[in-house]
Interface confidence: low
């Protein structure tokens, strides 16, 4: 019975010893008495394609059309989207289904962490300090008389005790003022005021003191000014 080759190409033909008829043993993907009918693998129940891939029947077999993010004959392989190192600036790449996500290092943003965040955008420097944008930080160049990370501190110009002779120091922005005690003058109250100038003693010689003077009177004169 096999002489006439009734079985489809690729199948094995055997003769039934009882009735002498041909028995066709079908290869995978074919069925029927002559193995001429294609098996629709996509209609057998369970989808042979994993991860929701689309099954396409072909002659004697099937193909899987995979969703984005999967590959392989049965869509069994999860594509690692991070293999191409898409994330920049030392960012962490998360391999997600069909895409990647970049977790940026501080100071960067954007889909690929490609944008260096402008930390000066919020004008963080006080008292007209100049902001310099750095990676993940900013630096304030402070005007004279101010310091601190944000130029927030008024420098205490009185810290060096510039005022002399018991004077009081008043701190101001980038300056200080000395309030002198009686009898002293000058920027730092360093000058003892000469109370003998002009000469207050009418008939005598003048002796200067601190905020005062003394008249040494000539014989025959008296009074505070030898008057």
């Amino acid at each position: 019975a096999c002489i006439s080759n009734p079985c489809n190409e690729g199948s094995n033909c055997d003769t039934n010893p009882v009735n002498g008829k041909a028995i066709c043993t079908c290869p995978s993907g074919y069925t029927g008495p002559a193995c001429s009918q294609d098996v629709d693998e996509c209609a057998l129940g369970a989808n042979p394609c994993e991860h929701a891939g689309k099954c396409l029947n072909t002659l004697g077999s099937f193909e899987c059309q995979c969703l984005q993010g999967y590959t392989g004959p049965r869509c069994e392989i999860d594509v690692n989207e991070c293999i191409s190192n898409p994330c920049q600036n030392d960012a962490t790449c998360l391999d997600q289904i069909g895409e990647f996500q970049c977790i940026c290092m501080p100071g960067y943003e954007g889909v690929y962490c490609e944008i260096n965040t402008d930390e000066c955008a919020s004008s963080p420097c006080l008292h007209n300090g100049h902001c310099m944008d750095k990676i993940n930080e900013f630096q304030c160049q402070c005007p004279k008389g101010f310091n601190g990370h944000l130029c927030q501190y008024d420098v205490d110009e009185c810290a060096s005790t510039p005022c002399k002779n018991g004077a009081k120091c008043l701190d101001g922005p980038n300056t200080y003022t000395c309030v002198c005690t009686e009898g002293y003058t000058g920027t730092h109250c360093e000058v003892d005021i000469d109370e003998c100038d002009p000469d207050p003693c009418h008939y005598g010689s003048c002796k200067d003191g601190v905020a005062t003077f003394t008249c040494l009177c000539q014989p025959g004169y008296t009074g505070h000014h030898c008057e």
């Epitope: 984005q68 962490t92 998360l94 997600q96 069909g98 895409e99 940026c104 501080p106 943003e109 965040t117």
Partner: antibody, heavy 115, light 110 residues
Framework: EVQLLESGGGLVQPGGSLRLSCAAS????????MSWVRQAPGKGLEWVSS????????YYADSVKGRFTISRDNSKNTLYLQMNSLRAEDTAVYYC????????WGQGTLVTVSS | QSALTQPASVSGSPGQSITISCTGT?????????VSWYQQHPGKAPKLMIY???NRPSGVSNRFSGSKSGNTASLTISGLQAEDEADYYC?????????FGGGTKLTVLG
């Protein structure tokens, strides 16, 4: 100004459906994955669903899988959440959120599931 | 997708410092630098206070700081003020979603 504005909330019976919308403005919408986060009355925040920038990938919390569908229309700068087979436990304020370094959240829309 | 663990409530007096912990696993907090903290006042949307573990968005007071050790993240608020009274939520990435903590109610005493 970067803004998200939700709409579509309301009262619905158990088993019913509702579609939430979120209008985005002030940023390049397609550059960002977007999410829905909900908050039941007196409870904490619960992540519901996320979608990638071009809509090719979606993610769902187990509690809503198979019932909710997230989608987006980048030409309209709008995010959607289609909610089917609603249950009483889905009652919550639903927030549309851009969860990123510069996070942006909407003010929320209340969904009440009750007979 | 199980929630991160936070204490239900913490309290402190004005001027004091408090710390709120947030415990996860190696799949979320331990696996990524992505930990955020949100502040939420009643009836309002959450406001981002800390991102990437320890970074403050512009406009957030430097009294707020964040840190992470292993699978636990922490939010510290120094110099407590009355307006800090609110709910605080931690949030982390896991492999394909976002996960939140259960929330901590901060009460400022007095």
């Amino acid at each position: 100004e970067v803004q998200l504005l939700e709409s579509g909330g309301g009262l619905v019976q158990p088993g019913g459906s509702l579609r939430l919308s979120c209008a985005a403005s002030g940023f390049t919408f397609s550059n960002y994955g977007m999410s829905w986060v909900r908050q039941a009355p007196g409870k904490g925040l619960e992540w519901v669903s996320s979608i990638s920038g071009y809509g090719s990938n979606t993610y769902y919390a187990d509690s809503v899988k198979g019932r909710f569908t997230i989608s987006r229309d980048n030409s309209k700068n709008t995010l959607y959440l289609q909610m089917n087979s609603l249950r009483a436990e889905d009652t919550a304020v639903y927030y549309c959120a851009r969860i990123s370094q510069q996070a942006v959240w909407g003010q929320g829309t209340l969904v009440t599931v009750s007979s | 997708q199980s929630a991160l663990t936070q204490p239900a409530s913490v309290s402190g007096s004005p001027g004091q410092s408090i710390t709120i912990s947030c415990t996860g696993t190696s799949s979320d907090i331990g696996g990524y630098q992505y930990v955020s903290w949100y502040q939420q006042h009643p009836g309002k949307a959450p406001k981002l206070m800390i991102y990437y573990v320890s970074n403050r968005p512009s406009g957030v007071s430097n009294r707020f700081s964040g840190s992470k050790s292993g699978n636990t993240a922490s939010l510290t608020i120094s110099g407590l003020q009355a307006e800090d009274e609110a709910d605080y939520y931690c949030q982390s990435a896991d492999s394909s979603s976002w996960v939140f903590g259960g929330g901590t109610k901060l009460t400022v005493l007095g």
